[in-house]
Interface confidence: low
């Protein structure tokens, strides 16, 4: 090989020995019959050399800098030339570093030929293994701007007191062009400005200077961003970190088209702004650290661009200004991401603040729009506390559990509407009345409606699920003992059509002991099935639930057990099942750790099945099924 | 208080699926990262992966991507993670982890779930 | 990837001396480093995050230092509790790698 500077050139050649490996052989460079494992050569030098193994690339790399000095006379602006020719060179790893020195009132700007750049994080590498390193420099200290791969967005980054700009080519790239031309510009007065430009829908991950270490103190860097009119943009933030500020606050600052209030200014905790449509700039300001405790400031964003989807232009009004304890989340729908773009799906707040998900509060009248590819990728979870604080005040009061019409317009998918129902404690219990009687979803016989009620205790140390409920069976009423909290879930799309079903009034009742009862009106011929609370985990330890079941005159029911032992061991305490006549009294005792299920009885009156769980060992648990079927008297029952 | 409940014990056969659950406790689910992390038997710790529990987005380590799927039910604070064509070297206990943002430190983790693939 | 080194891989001490336990990044990870201890049958516990800072509810005999590539774990005075696994944890970026571990028993 050989390698010839020209003088003046103020390039400098350096091959040396690379990330050492593990190959057993050494190899050398080899200069009149010299083994050296380093070779520089300087501007106005000829070297010949060759190496002493056949595969140089697994052992040496070749680092090209040059050297461009804009403080002492004209700066050669225009394309930049690899020099020398790739051609000419070695197959090895090759860096070529352009060093610019300017004075501080020079702004310098790098432009990228297509294709344009795109911005990798650290332990990232490119796929093609080219790969651009820029840095500036603040007074003698080194910024760095960023690592970029091909392939991307940014078109020109613009800085001022020099740049340091770092091509790294792997051995096999055959690429002999550098792909940018440096332009001398005004000052810019700020660290950098990178432009970003996007001809169709995309994203682009961007950072911060020196990221991830901290941005310069009290710095200022300027993105900005190039977007097609008929698209809409939206920023989000992946991550960041805030320094401790002794003086100013640290901030980004957007100029949006159209803004009135231009800069708008959010600290990074914000909620970013989305549904941008056209060009806008981003600014990200340092403070003044603390000396003793400076910490850092960093910031990792993404910028989504798409095309504004038909929702995007309507404004929905969600009136919860006379609600109380109320809040409304709009949210993805938990999916499996997929590998390839997906366009953002976002909730605006007054069509400018936008994000993956939104909570709405009781007490204001909100104004949303959406900006989203497919609604279906959204649903809505509501909360609603009904409370009572004072026992005198509430007592037989009612509420209407339903879905307020507001909620149902909007064209997003309801999840989940949660109402926490709470009473002072010893004082109050509750009833849930259903506009249409329910039945219990059970393996045996599940719901098949659009939606179903949850009902569950709502104390915090208490894990009790009384069951999921749906219209269209035979529960008439269920009083609970204490707080709980009720959640309409939604199945399928057709709960809007099914809406009018739904319909629960809660009232608040006189205090009772048991955790417990439901009222049972079976409807002749349909088979009941009923199971205790906690199905899946047991009865909680020491708690009692009733079910209070209604016999018509002419009808005679059948209470069947399916299983033969309740399977229950208790540590302390008995269980027990009682079953009572409500006619004349008379009741049954079942120990339901010791003896066995009763077989199918017939019962020709209304009757109570209560059930009492111990202090159960654990694995050993309390789980009963049972089911009445109503058959008119005259059949012959032997 | 903060709490990791993750599901009990797995034994399973090559080729079947198993599917880990770590249910969230005591904070907002959707606040923080959760992390997989795997131990084999007598070995070390290796991270598997993250999803983001705000938008359920997961990233995966190299060596955990095509049979393993980390997914969420935010409306029950649950993480689960999913293994499908189970192998004998998946034999190890699998830790769900809380973490912060894009460079976590684990503060909490689930009592771990010991799942056996053997014939 | 980040390759985490530690060494050494078993430290015998006993009660009151003093643990240096280290750990090498295969590049620089600035202060993305966070160290956990494990022991037998239990999940690992959080002792220091971004390589110094220390957690509440851990012991101040337990310290952090180093930036870059080069970390230090130092329990100033061993109690008989600390004899388990050591991790170190890079943070830096995907995928977060662990180190192999120390074990610190008891000699």
């Known amino acids: 090989f050989e390698i010839a500077l020209p003088r003046e050139s103020n390039i400098t050649v350096l091959i040396k020995l690379g990330t050492p490996t593990l190959l057993a052989k050494p190899c050398y460079i080899v200069i009149s019959k010299r083994h050296i494992t380093m070779l520089s050569i300087k501007s106005g030098e000829r070297i010949v050399f060759t190496f002493s193994c056949q595969s140089p690339e697994n052992h040496f790399v070749i680092e090209i800098q040059k050297n461009i000095d804009c403080m002492s006379g004209p700066c050669p602006f225009g394309e930049v030339q690899l020099q020398p020719s790739t051609s000419l060179l070695p197959t090895l790893n090759r860096t070529f570093i352009w060093d610019v020195k300017a004075h501080k009132s020079i702004g310098l700007e790098l432009q990228f030929s297509i294709p344009r750049l795109r911005q990798i994080g650290p332990g990232e590498s490119c796929p093609d293994g080219v790969t651009h390193s820029i840095s500036g420099r603040i007074d003698a200290t080194v910024v760095r701007i960023g690592t970029f791969c091909s392939n991307g967005t940014v078109s020109r980054i613009k800085m001022q007191e020099g740049v340091k700009m770092a091509l790294h080519l792997p051995w096999f790239h055959p690429r002999n062009v550098s792909g940018f031309s440096i332009a001398n510009r005004s000052s810019i007065k700020r660290l950098c400005i990178i432009e970003s430009v996007f001809e169709g829908e995309g994203s682009a991950t961007l950072m911060s200077a020196n990221y991830p270490e901290g941005f310069p103190e009290d710095e200022l860097m300027t993105w900005q961003f190039v977007v097609p009119a008929h698209l809409r943009a939206s920023v989000s933030f992946l991550n960041f970190n805030l320094s401790n500020c002794e003086r100013k606050e640290e901030r980004v600052e957007y100029y949006i088209p159209g803004s009135t209030t231009n800069p708008e200014v959010f600290k990074l905790e914000d909620k970013q702004p989305g549904n941008m449509a056209g060009n806008f700039n981003l600014s990200l300001q340092g403070c003044d650290q603390d000396a003793q405790s400076p910490g850092i400031l960093r910031l990792q964003f993404q910028v989504l661009v798409q095309h504004p989807q038909n929702e995007s232009n309507k404004i929905y009004v969600v009136d919860l200004s006379n609600e109380r304890a109320m809040s409304l989340t709009i949210e993805p729908r938990p999916v499996k991401q997929s590998r390839k773009f997906v366009p953002g799906c976002f909730v605006c707040l007054e069509s400018r603040t936008c994000s993956s998900n939104l909570t709405l509060t009781s007490g204001s009248k909100h104004k949303i729009s959406f900006l989203c590819d497919d609604l279906t990728r959204l649903w809505m979870n509501v909360e609603k506390t009904i409370s009572c604080t004072d026992h005198r005040y509430c007592q037989r009061k009612s509420y209407s559990l339903q879905v307020p019409s507001d909620i149902l317009h909007l064209p997003v998918e309801l999840h989940d509407f949660s109402w926490k129902l709470l009473v002072p404690k010893d004082r109050l219990s509750l009833v849930l009345v259903p506009a249409q009687k329910l039945q219990q979803h059970t393996h045996e016989k599940p719901c098949n409606t659009s939606f179903s009620y949850l009902v569950a205790s709502a104390i915090p140390s208490q894990d009790l699920y009384f069951g999921s409920f749906c219209p269209g069976g035979s529960i008439k009423q269920i009083q609970v003992k204490q707080n709980i909290s009720v959640t309409l879930r939604t199945f399928a799309p057709s709960f809007q059509q099914e809406a009018s079903r739904q319909g629960l009034t809660v009232s608040f009742i006189p205090y009772f002991k048991e955790e417990g009862v439901f009222t049972v009106t079976p409807d002749t011929k349909s088979k009941v099935y009923l199971r205790t609370p906690n199905w899946d985990r047991g009865l909680p330890s020491l708690t009692s639930v009733s079910w209070n079941i209604s016999v018509p005159r002419d009808q005679v029911a059948c209470l069947t057990f399916f299983k033969e032992r309740s399977g229950v061991v208790c540590q302390t305490g008995r269980a027990f099942m009682i079953i009572q006549e409500q006619r004349t009294r008379a009741e049954e005792i079942f120990s339901l750790d010791e003896d066995v299920l009763p077989k199918p009885s017939f019962h020709h009156h209304s009757f109570w099945v209560n059930i009492s769980n111990c202090s159960p060992t654990s694995g050993k648990q309390l789980d009963l099924l049972f089911s009445v079927t109503l058959t008119p008297r005259t059949v012959d029952l032997t | 208080q903060v709490q990791l409940v993750q599901s009990g014990s797995e034994l399973k056969k090559p080729g079947e699926s198993v599917k880990v659950s770590c249910k969230a406790s005591?904070?907002?689910?959707?606040?923080?990262?959760m992390h997989w992390v795997r131990q084999a038997p007598g070995q070390g710790l290796e991270w598997m992966g993250w999803i983001n529990t705000e938008t359920g987005a997961p990233t995966y380590a190299d060596d955990f991507k095509g049979r393993f799927v980390l997914s969420l039910d935010t409306s029950v604070s649950t993480a689960y993670l999913q293994i499908s064509s189970l192998k004998s070297e998946d034999t190890a206990v699998y830790y769900c982890s809380r973490g912060r943002d894009y460079d976590p430190h684990f503060d909490y983790w689930g009592q771990g779930t010991l799942v056996t693939v053997s014939s | 990837e980040i390759v985490l080194t530690q060494s050494p891989a078993t430290l015998s001490l006993s009660p009151g001396e003093r643990a240096t336990l280290s750990c090498r990044a295969s590049q620089s990870i600035s202060d993305f480093l966070h160290w956990y201890q494990q022991k037998p049958g239990q999940s690992p516990r959080l002792l220091i995050k971004?390589?110094?800072q220390s957690i509440s509810g851990i012991p101040a005999r337990f310290s952090g230092s180093g930036s870059g590539s080069d970390f230090t774990l130092t329990i100033s005075s061993v109690e008989p509790e600390d004899f388990a696994v050591y991790y170190c944890?890079?943070?830096?970026?995907?995928?977060?790698?662990f180190g192999q571990g120390t074990k610190l028993e008891i000699k």
């Open positions: 005591g904070y907002t689910l959707t606040d923080f990262s």
């Open positions: 944890q890079s943070a830096h970026s995907f995928p977060y790698t």
């Open positions: 971004y390589a110094s």
